[in-house]
Each structure stands twice: as structure tokens, then as C-alpha cells.
């Protein structure tokens, strides 16, 4: 693969990663596809410092991240281990709530208006953040 040494135009560099912040909304799967075609992935939050950086850029707006449990356990799209990794859920979340009336539960994670995380219906059209790492040969993102 080819190594990326600087961020693409319109992306923001932070701690050797590049971030792109959408201005519009998509369902989680469509947002995931958008990032993948850009050789990136939905943002994977690995530290409180990264959480604060993303939160600063998105503001108080529901925004998808690269975390889902559509196949059972919670998984980060880049393979980062969920169980041992950073988490910032709202109290009593995730709750896989079925009461929304849209069918099924809640399988995709997003930043809420205060930055903490919630699980929600993956079809909701939220904004999203793409991330790609610098100095790392690009490779095919893992399948969901």
C-alpha cells in the first residue's frame, strides 16, 4: 500500500491522524462507505485527548463514530479492541433501546450533544467523522 505522509486537502491533522468532519447527515452504513472510499474509516476514539479533540470540532451535534454492535459484540471498525479500550458512554448507555418504534434495537454509536456516547438506530441521518492514520500503509479496512 501507499503511505500517507500529510493530510489530504480539507482534512485536519492531529496527533499523526487526519480527520474529516461532515457538514451533513447520513445513515451509519452510508457514512462508513463514504469514509472507506476516501481510504479512511469512521473515527475510532482511543483516548480522552482524542475525544476532546473530536468533541471540539463537532460541537453539540449528534455525530456517528466507528463503533457498532450490528453483529453482536461492540466493535471498532479498524479492529481496535473494544473491551480494553477507551469508552465514554452516557450513564445507562448503551441500552439497545427498542422503544423508538423503528424496528430492532440500537446498534451504532454516536457522540451526543455533550460529547458522551449513545447507541442509536443506525438509519438515523447523523453527521459523521472520518479518520485516517499518517505514516501507515493504507490497507483494506476490516469487513463488518
Amino acid at each position: 500500500g501507499s503511505e500517507r505522509t500529510c493530510c489530504p486537502v480539507n482534512w485536519v491533522e492531529h496527533e499523526r491522524s487526519c480527520y474529516w468532519f461532515s457538514r451533513s447527515g447520513k445513515a451509519w452504513a452510508d457514512a462508513d462507505n463514504y469514509c472507506r472510499l476516501e481510504d479512511a474509516h469512521l473515527v475510532v476514539v482511543t483516548s480522552w485527548e482524542e475525544q476532546k479533540f473530536v468533541q471540539h470540532h463537532i460541537g453539540p451535534v449528534n455525530t456517528w463514530m466507528g463503533l457498532h454492535d450490528q453483529n453482536g459484540p461492540w466493535k471498532w471498525v479498524d479492529g481496535t479492541d473494544y473491551e480494553t479500550g477507551f469508552k465514554n458512554w452516557r450513564p445507562e448507555q448503551p441500552d439497545d433501546w427498542y422503544g423508538h418504534g423503528l424496528g430492532g434495537g440500537e446498534d451504532c454509536a454516536h457522540f451526543t450533544d455533550d460529547g458522551r456516547w449513545n447507541d442509536d438506530v443506525c438509519q438515523r441521518p447523523y453527521r459523521w467523522v472520518c479518520e485516517t492514520e499518517l505514516d501507515k500503509a493504507s490497507q483494506e479496512p476490516p469487513l463488518l
Epitope: 501507499s2 486537502v9 480539507n10 447527515g25 462507505n33 472507506r36 472510499l37 481510504d39 490497507q139 479496512p141
Partner: antibody, heavy 120, light 107 residues
């Protein structure tokens, strides 16, 4: 000068296969997603497929899904479209196209096109 | 998939006329809307990208506007070389669909 040059078109029978190539020059090929777009005689433009710069992500129009495969060789600056199980309705001029910057930008550079005719 | 509907499908006009072509997306497409010009036997050429940004080298008589689902291409004063076919395209979501085209003919 940024250039794209398609090749590999021709006459093929229904059910047959062809592989189109698109040779790129004048830009850092691996940094750009690439696309195939086709145009049937006297008709409009139809997007066929896209591939990310690394080749890790591929997308297809429903009309070609399962029959066509997009790929790239970044060491050769070449984009490919493997077309199998060809049908009469695949007859068209096939263009490769490069976006302005990001994968979701407009197609800034187009090749001259290569004609594919599917007929018995 | 996002369907793109262009109107009119054909248009007759004279040199110096102001011409407007519209494009409607079946789903929200933000400002990921591009306009192309194509002449017979040639590859398309991008005129407008991101709904309203003029591609460098394209004459300023071409302009684009709109956001969301409704978009417009305007040619303020037609020149002889503008008679061609025009296509809109959304690049918000794959498949990156095109409108069916507008053929601009000399009256």
C-alpha cells in the same frame, strides 16, 4: 500533464469477457480514488464503479454488480475493469475518470474512452 | 440510490440568451452536485463542482446554485461553443448517479 488512456475495448459475444485498462500519468495515482463511467450509443452517462486509492474499497452500480470487478495496480499506475457475463446492454463507450481531490469530488479528468460492443 | 432528474431534456436557444437547467435529486445530496458539458464524440468536461464552484478555466458565464435536492445551472449569455449536452451528477453517495442530460440546441 495529467492524462488517462483507456484500452482493451472491442467486439465480444454475449456471455463473454473483456478487461479494460486505464493508464494514468501526470499525478500521484495512488492518492486518488478512480472511477469507470460508461455511455451507451446516443444515451446519457452511467457511473459504473469506483475504487479507493489503496484499492481497499470498491463500489458498483447495481447493473454490473457481480459481473464487473474494478481493481488497480498502483505500481503500474493502472486502473482495470474486468467485465464478465457481458450483455448487449453493456455496449457503450467506457471512460475512466479521476476526481478533483477527494473521492466524492467531481470527475476532473476523463480518458478518451474505449468502445465495448457486445453482439453475436 | 439517489435518482437525478434533469429538466428540460432538450432546449432550443439563441446566442446571447440566458439559459437555466435544473436538476432534482430524489434524496438529500448536500452540495455534492456537479455539472458537466459534453460535445459529440468527446469525453465530458466538468464545469461546476460542489453545486456552485466554477472549475478553473471555465468561463464565468456559467454558474451553479442550489443545495439539498434542487440545483440549477445557468448560462448567462450563450456563446456558439455552448451548444452541447449538459449532465448533472451527485457525488454524495455511491452509486454516483447522473441526470439523463439536457441537449442545448441552436434555435
Amino acid at each position: 500533464e495529467v492524462q488517462l488512456l483507456e484500452s482493451g475495448g472491442g467486439l465480444v459475444q454475449p456471455g463473454g469477457s473483456l478487461r479494460l485498462s486505464c493508464a494514468a500519468s501526470g499525478f500521484t495515482f495512488s492518492s486518488y480514488a478512480m472511477n469507470w463511467v460508461r455511455q451507451a450509443p446516443g444515451k446519457g452517462l452511467e457511473w459504473v464503479s469506483a475504487i479507493s486509492g489503496s484499492g481497499g474499497a470498491t463500489y458498483y452500480a447495481d447493473s454490473v454488480k457481480g459481473r464487473f470487478t474494478i481493481s488497480r495496480d498502483n505500481s503500474k499506475n493502472t486502473l482495470y475493469l474486468q467485465m464478465n457475463s457481458l450483455r448487449a446492454e453493456d455496449t457503450a463507450v467506457y471512460y475512466c475518470a479521476k476526481p478533483l481531490v477527494g473521492a466524492h469530488d467531481a470527475f476532473e479528468i476523463w480518458g478518451q474512452g474505449t468502445m465495448v460492443t457486445v453482439s453475436s | 440510490d439517489i435518482q437525478m432528474t434533469q429538466s428540460p431534456s432538450s432546449l432550443s436557444a439563441s446566442v446571447g440568451d440566458r439559459v437555466t437547467i435544473t436538476c432534482r435529486a430524489s434524496q438529500y445530496s448536500s452540495d455534492y452536485l456537479n455539472w458537466y458539458q459534453q460535445k459529440p464524440g468527446k469525453a465530458p468536461k466538468v464545469l461546476i463542482f460542489a453545486a456552485s464552484s466554477l472549475k478553473s478555466g471555465v468561463p464565468s458565464r456559467f454558474s451553479g446554485s442550489g443545495s439539498g435536492t434542487d440545483f440549477t445551472l445557468t448560462i448567462s449569455s450563450l456563446e456558439p461553443e455552448d451548444f452541447a449536452t449538459y449532465f448533472c451528477q451527485q457525488s454524495y453517495s455511491t452509486p454516483f448517479t447522473f441526470g439523463q442530460g439536457t441537449r442545448l440546441e441552436i434555435k
